[in-house]
């Protein structure tokens, strides 16, 4: 007896973080024997969507012409072959930005910092939120969460970095969110350029170098040391 059908591959184009109102296409790739593809969304009635395969039958396209809150969430896909349904794909998390007004990102005491010193990035929202995310451009794993304990609402989150080295330099943005949906984020803050000076022994990497998809030095800025701030927020690294 044959084993279970191999699980399909699920991905989104142009990516899995989509601004409100923009289009996104979800692709599910199975095998040439696929007769039908099914997409399920976590915590929603199933099936979320069904599509016939595109020739040569090894994948299907699920189109979202205009991103809204309804489409944000965690998806899996399956395909049906003559011998039955496949295993589910690995999950795809589709995140929508633009659900809330943009926060403000600032650096204390200054965005110009000397190597070896300390700096704190401060993300502030106009309305109270319970999750804040810091994004560093071109980082392999760019998300750092600060989530409040017990659902307490905060107007700001602090991201301390100490001691600062040259790899902390770069462009940052932050987002805010409510805990009831981790898939709905605010508009991004305006970018903040953190400039690290006075480091000869630790030169900054060339800005034109290719981005690695594996963990590496570019991840280090998002792992600040020090205790969790007194704001009641708990730190999560992803």
């Amino acid at each position: 007896q044959a084993g279970p059908l191999p699980k399909p591959t699920l991905w989104a184009e142009p990516g899995s973080v989509i601004s409100w109102g923009n289009s996104v296409t979800i692709w599910c790739q199975g095998t040439l024997e696929a007769r039908e593809y099914r997409l399920d969304k976590e915590e929603s009635p199933a099936p979320w969507d069904r599509q016939n395969p595109l020739e040569p039958k090894n994948k299907a396209r699920f189109s979202i012409p205009s991103m809204t809150e309804d489409y944000a969430g965690r998806y899996r896909c399956y395909y049906r072959s003559p011998v039955g349904w496949s295993q589910p794909s690995d999950p795809l998390e589709l995140v929508m930005t633009g659900a809330y007004s943009k926060p403000t990102l600032s650096a204390l005491p200054s965005p110009l910092v000397t190597s070896g010193k300390s700096v704190t990035l401060l993300c502030q929202s106009r309305s109270p939120m319970d999750t804040f995310l810091l994004i560093k451009e071109r980082a392999a794993h760019p998300l750092l969460h600060l989530r409040s304990e017990h659902g307490a609402q905060q107007h700001q989150a602090e991201f301390p970095m100490s001691p600062v080295t040259s790899v902390h330099g770069g462009t940052y943005r932050c987002f805010s969110s409510h805990g009831f949906s981790h898939y709905l984020l605010s508009h991004p803050s305006d970018p903040l350029e953190l400039i690290v000076s006075g480091s000869l022994e630790d030169p900054r990497p060339s800005p034109t170098r290719s981005v690695s998809t594996a963990a590496g030095p570019e991840d280090q800025p998002l792992m600040p040391t020090g205790s969790v701030p007194h704001s009641g927020l708990r730190r999560h690294w992803e």
């Epitope: 399920d40 929603s44 009635p45 199933a46 099936p47």
Partner: nanobody
């Protein structure tokens, strides 16, 4: 061939209850979200409730706490239990089937003929 057949509509007093049924062909019932829409004169068609093959449900805001939806897999039938009915619940109720994303777009793949529910004061 009629693939969705509704029953159970009628006239009821405000505060009363009704249970609508929708029988579907096995091929449709086993692979689709089943749900109910309603439409009253001068109003757009509104999603009342839906239930997936995974048992998860979506209930419209205007009927939350009063209406429940369930599906009987052995009978290929979906039920809408309507309690504490109000005059404003008066409408033609349509059974529908399709992928859930089609319900969000108000365009399920299959529709019944509709059954009239009238709530009097």
């Amino acid at each position: 061939e009629v693939q969705l057949v509704e029953s159970g509509g009628g006239l009821v007093q405000a505060g009363g209850s009704l249970r609508l049924s929708c029988a579907a062909s096995e091929s449709i019932f086993s692979s689709n979200v089943m749900g109910w829409y309603r439409q009253s004169p001068g109003h757009q068609r509104e999603l009342v409730a839906a239930v997936g093959i995974n048992g998860l449900t979506k209930i419209g805001d205007s009927v939350k706490g009063r209406f429940t939806i369930s599906r009987d897999n052995a009978k290929n039938t979906v039920y809408l239990q309507m309690n504490s009915l109000k005059v404003e619940d008066t409408a033609v109720y349509y059974c529908a089937a399709g992928a859930y994303v089609r319900f969000l777009q108000n365009s399920p793949d299959y529709w019944g003929q509709g059954t009239q529910v009238t709530v009097s004061s």
